[in-house]
């Protein structure tokens, strides 16, 4: 049968950053093409992404029903124009992927920086609180709003002239800093979850600068 | 299990240089960020500096600035504390330690200590 | 920086007895302190974190707590293994400071 020349999909990987979701495989396809499921551990499988000829397949659909539950997808291989061809068992050859909890797992996106503003010696920094693909209401949620208070952000900030980084850290989205009057300091952000193993930190936002445009200043 | 191990210590001159080793096992220092902290004989404690392997930032006491530097080598899961100028008062025992990076920062896990001593 | 006052510097106490240690931040810090037990020739260790709460496999008898900017440390049934040094640390600003350290002796 044609079923001898498909071969089963491999290095299944979740792609995830906050909760947007791609599930990857190898090989590119020759003759064949592929179709996804997914499913909770308790729940039915749903499929996905039918016989396509991509290696990948965007599932955050499916995750961000509940995004701390813990999910299981599965890759099948078809014959190219064959796809009701099966495998010598009489299924069609598939490969699971890890199991994935968006909650634990998703990557934390880069943070920005949304706005400074100093007041004489206190320094407001506040951090955008980036939307994300999870729906409460048929509203879009915000990190802030799915993570609450597990996720905090670490502030560095320094004088442009010194080159040691200060922290802060706040479970809202915004820092409160003191500062030495007449000095211009630089601010990076980082979003992190300290209850998680892996995956516990975001890369660094940009590094905003007062004097530029994001910033404001108010002499009191 | 988590475990920090610090290394590189001994005897060495005034002027002299040491570069102390922390290696970490059960978890990734690009994760966390990483303390050095001494404490003298007989003595309380006292935070040396830190780095944030992820991205290399790095602060030290005033006590070491410029003559201390922290750095990390994330692909040995190893954060360095190089000693350059020491001073008799340099002289302790260092520890590094684990920052949780939560709202507290509390130094969760600490290494055994390694004793510099500076002496001629 | 900000400066942890710790205090006493050393009591001693008896097997059994209520102990209880503070610090005193020179301005605010929430309630980033933790406290750190130290025994001879041996790393601190967690002890309480975020000012009360208790770290993970450390006995209920100690507590943390704290009144502005006032910590303290109580032990509420000293026991023999408990006599050791006891550092307070804050963390809300940079640099992270240590109080001066209670040593906890048999009296």
């Known amino acids: 049968s044609g079923t001898t020349n498909t071969v089963a999909a491999y290095n299944l990987t979740w792609k995830s950053t906050n909760f947007k979701t791609i599930l990857e495989w190898e090989p590119k396809p020759v003759n064949q093409v592929y179709t996804v499921q997914i499913s909770t551990k308790s729940g039915d499988w749903k499929s996905k992404c039918f016989y396509t000829t991509d290696t990948e397949c965007d599932l955050t659909d499916e995750i961000v029903k509940d995004v701390k539950q813990t999910y299981l997808a599965r890759v099948f291989s078809y014959p190219a124009g064959n796809v009701e061809s099966t495998g010598s068992a009489g299924e069609p050859l598939y490969e699971n992927s890890p199991e994935f909890t968006p909650y634990l797992e998703t990557n934390l996106g880069q943070p920005t920086i949304q706005s400074f503003e100093q007041v004489g010696t206190k320094v407001n920094v506040t951090v955008e609180d980036e939307r994300t693909l999870v729906r409460r209401n048929n509203t879009f949620l915000s990190l802030r709003d799915v993570f609450g208070k597990d996720l905090i952000y670490t502030l560095y900030y320094w004088k442009s002239s010194s080159s040691g980084k200060k922290t802060a850290k706040t479970n809202t989205n915004e820092f409160l800093i003191d500062v030495d009057k007449g000095e211009n300091y630089c601010f990076s952000v980082q979003a992190v979850i300290p209850s998680r193993t892996v995956n516990r930190k975001s890369t660094d936002s940009p590094v905003e600068c007062m004097g530029q445009e994001k910033g404001e200043f108010r002499e009191i | 299990e988590v475990q920090l191990v610090e290394s590189g210590g001994g005897l060495v001159q005034p002027g002299g240089s040491l570069r102390l080793s922390c290696a970490a096992s059960?978890?990734?220092?690009?994760?966390?960020?990483i303390h050095w902290v001494r404490q003298a004989p007989g003595k309380g404690l006292e935070w040396v500096g830190y780095i944030d392997p992820s991205n290399g930032y790095t602060y030290y006491a005033d006590s070491v600035k410029g003559r201390f530097t922290i750095s990390a080598d994330t692909s040995k899961n190893t954060a360095y504390l190089q000693m350059n100028s020491l001073r008799a008062e340099d002289t302790a025992v260092y520890y590094c330690?684990?920052?949780?990076?939560?709202?507290?920062?509390?130094?969760?896990?600490w290494g055994q200590g390694t004793l510099v001593t500076v002496s001629s | 920086d900000i400066q942890m006052t710790q205090s006493p510097s050393s009591l001693s106490a008896s097997v059994g007895d209520r102990v209880t240690i503070t610090c005193r931040a020179s301005q605010d810090v929430n309630t980033a302190v933790a406290w750190y037990q130290q025994k001879p020739g041996k790393a601190p260790k967690l002890l309480i974190y975020?000012?009360?709460f208790l770290y993970s496999g450390v006995p209920s008898r100690f507590s943390g707590s704290r009144s502005g900017t006032d910590f303290t440390l109580t032990i509420s049934s000293l026991q023999p293994e408990d006599f050791a040094t006891y550092y307070c640390?804050?963390?809300?600003?940079?640099?992270?400071?240590f109080g001066q350290g209670t040593k906890v002796e048999i009296k």
């Open positions: 059960g978890f990734t220092i690009s994760g966390y960020i």
């Open positions: 640390q804050q963390h809300y600003t940079t640099p992270p400071t």
């Open positions: 330690a684990r920052d949780d990076q939560s709202l507290s920062s509390p130094f969760d896990y």
């Open positions: 975020s000012a009360s």
